[in-house]
Interface confidence: low
């Protein structure tokens, strides 16, 4: 006869491990007892359990409550046992020794491998601002046994770098994703993908990118110079910019206070019916926590009674 077992048994941390040991004998042969022991190299054998054909299962004190026979129906030639709730410390070599009648004793070894699935964590990097060079966007760390694979899934262009630290029974892998921040990255997902043989499917953690920026400011409303004449109603200047965080707007007049009747409504400066008093230099100041921008325009209100042409200057400053 001969023993049938597995070279390697693989389980996930916390699962039950079936340690197989089946005697395939000739007709009429019987199994008297099966002894299970842990036999790691350099250490003496540590008894797990003894399975006796007449007296049943005896579990050694060190494994009390953790070693059981598989559920019925049971074959009298099957010496397999269940090791409940496998932990990392259970990883190692195991031996079953089978005493048969009349053929004598047989033994076989197997290796128990305990997979420790990772619990990944994603840490965003420092605040991203347009104009920075290559900057850490996020780092993702996963520790397990064996070492997990950590990759990134994103449409954003960037570079990755990985490092790993080996511990006594596991390995920690950290991957960093670096990028050159630009406003087009705002709202884009950056997903850390962790693969491991102990996971049924990849684990994914997503971070949404936020990039601070402030666009140049410009003023609209003076495109048609001839519309800015005495008596015109509904004249307005609009300040154009965009940013993240969304910017706030402030209007001032460079050559004095804003004329009475002029309404400030966020990015828009609304004028009452125009008079020559509305001529002047107007400044739009745009700011957010990241930066500030200015744009100034010169308004000349035309008097239709005069032949002199209206002058308009547009100046942008940052």
């Amino acid at each position: 006869g001969e023993l049938e077992t597995s070279d390697v048994v693989t389980v996930v941390l916390g699962q039950d491990a079936k340690l197989p040991c089946f005697y395939r004998g000739d007709s009429g042969e019987q199994v008297g007892q099966v002894a299970w022991a842990r036999v790691d190299a350099g250490e003496g054998a540590q008894e797990l359990a003894l399975l006796h054909s007449k007296y049943g299962l005896h579990v050694s004190p060190a494994y009390e409550g953790r070693v059981e026979q598989p559920p019925p129906p049971r074959n009298p030639l099957d010496g397999s046992v269940l090791l409940r709730n496998a932990v990392q410390a259970d990883e190692g070599e195991y031996e079953c020794r089978v005493s048969t009648f009349p053929a004598g004793s047989f033994q076989a070894r197997l290796r128990l491998r305990v997979l420790v699935p990772p619990l990944p964590s994603l840490n965003p990097g420092p605040a991203l601002e347009e104009g920075q060079g290559l900057t850490l966007a996020a780092s993702c760390t996963a520790e397990g046994s064996p070492a997990p694979s950590v990759t990134w899934d994103t449409e954003v262009k960037g570079t990755t770098s990985s490092r790993s630290f080996k511990h006594s029974r596991s390995a920690a892998v950290t991957s960093e994703f670096h990028l050159v921040p630009s406003r087009s990255m705002n709202g884009q997902p950056l997903t850390c993908v962790v693969s491991h043989p102990g996971l049924l499917q990849d684990q994914r953690i997503t971070h949404i990118l936020h990039v601070s920026f402030l666009a140049e400011a410009s003023v609209r409303g003076l495109e048609d110079q001839n519309l800015w004449h005495i008596g015109r109603e509904g004249a307005m200047l609009k300040c154009l910019s965009e940013g993240q965080p969304p910017p706030s707007y402030n209007w001032t007049r460079l050559d004095g206070p804003l004329p009475s009747g002029v309404r400030v409504d966020g990015d828009t400066l609304g004028f009452p019916p125009l008079t020559t008093e509305h001529s002047g230099i107007y400044v739009c100041h745009v700011s957010n926590e990241f930066s500030s921008r200015d744009s100034q325009v010169t308004v000349d209100v035309l008097d239709p009674q005069e032949d002199s042409g209206k002058q308009v200057d547009l100046v942008s400053a940052s």
Partner: antibody, heavy 117, light 106 residues
Framework: QVQLQQSGPGLVKPSETLSLTCTVS????????VHWVRQPPGKGLEWLGV???????DYNPSLKSRLTISRDTSKNQVSFKMSSVTAADTAVYYC???????????WGQGTLVTVSS | DIQMTQSPSSLSASVGDRVTITCRAS??????LAWYQQKPGKAPKLLVY???NLADGVPSRFSGSGSGTDYTLTISSLQPEDFATYYC????????FGGGTKVEIK
């Protein structure tokens, strides 16, 4: 335009398997994930699971053992199965679209599934 | 799982009112938060994603703010069509939704 059309029985017996289909148009299943969310009558929303654009799946851990999500890209269909249902599984079931992350920009019309004998 | 605590569970308001709904996560969700509006018998509609970004076609009276564990949805001037139930949802790992806030007519 983007649409998600749900189909499936409105009544399922206890201990049986609930099966729903989400047929999509206006986008490709190889570019977007399809999620399943449910809402018991008068209650809040609960995320159930997703099949990603690459075909991999993620499930709510509390329901993982009972859920199977699969797809047929040639038919633009996503299939949702929940086994061993009980009265507590009575809810409106929605499919919803997402990119590579977990918020949902387009939703199906919802299917009220009642679990009763 | 990360728990989302939404408050208030209901509120009464009038057209033109400023309405604020808050959502608190049991741990840092790094702005991975969405807000939805749901009307009776209808599917939810995405309003805000990534805490502050307005979804396509959503009126500018809606805005989202917050970071870390605390987030807010604000309706600057309530309109008749805004009476509905609002949900927050995090997408930092396994998604979970807040319990909802029903906005009713005063």
């Amino acid at each position: 335009q983007v649409q998600l059309q749900q189909s499936g029985p409105g009544l399922v017996k206890p201990s049986e398997t609930l099966s729903l289909t989400c047929t999509v148009s206006g986008f490709s299943l190889t570019n977007y994930g399809v999620h399943w969310v449910r809402q018991p009558p008068g209650k809040g929303l609960e995320w159930l699971g997703v099949i990603w654009s690459g075909g991999s799946t993620d499930y709510n851990p509390s329901l993982k053992s009972r859920l199977t999500i699969s797809r047929d890209t040639s038919k633009n269909q996503v299939s949702f199965k929940m086994s061993s249902v009980t009265a507590a599984d009575t809810a409106v079931y929605y499919c919803a679209r997402s990119g590579k992350w977990y918020y949902f920009d387009y939703w199906g019309q919802g299917t009220l599934v009642t679990v009763s004998s | 799982d990360i728990q989302m605590t939404q408050s208030p569970s209901s509120l009464s308001a009038s057209v033109g009112d400023r309405v604020t709904i808050t959502c608190r996560a049991s741990e840092n969700i790094y702005s991975n938060l969405a807000w939805y509006q749901q009307k009776p018998g209808k599917a939810p509609k995405l309003l805000v994603y990534a805490a502050t970004n307005l979804a396509d076609g959503v009126p500018s009276r809606f805005s989202g703010s917050g970071s870390g564990t605390d987030y807010t949805l604000t309706i600057s001037s309530l309109q008749p069509e805004d009476f509905a139930t609002y949900y927050c949802q995090h997408f930092w790992g396994t998604p979970t939704f807040g319990g909802g806030t029903k906005v009713e007519i005063k």
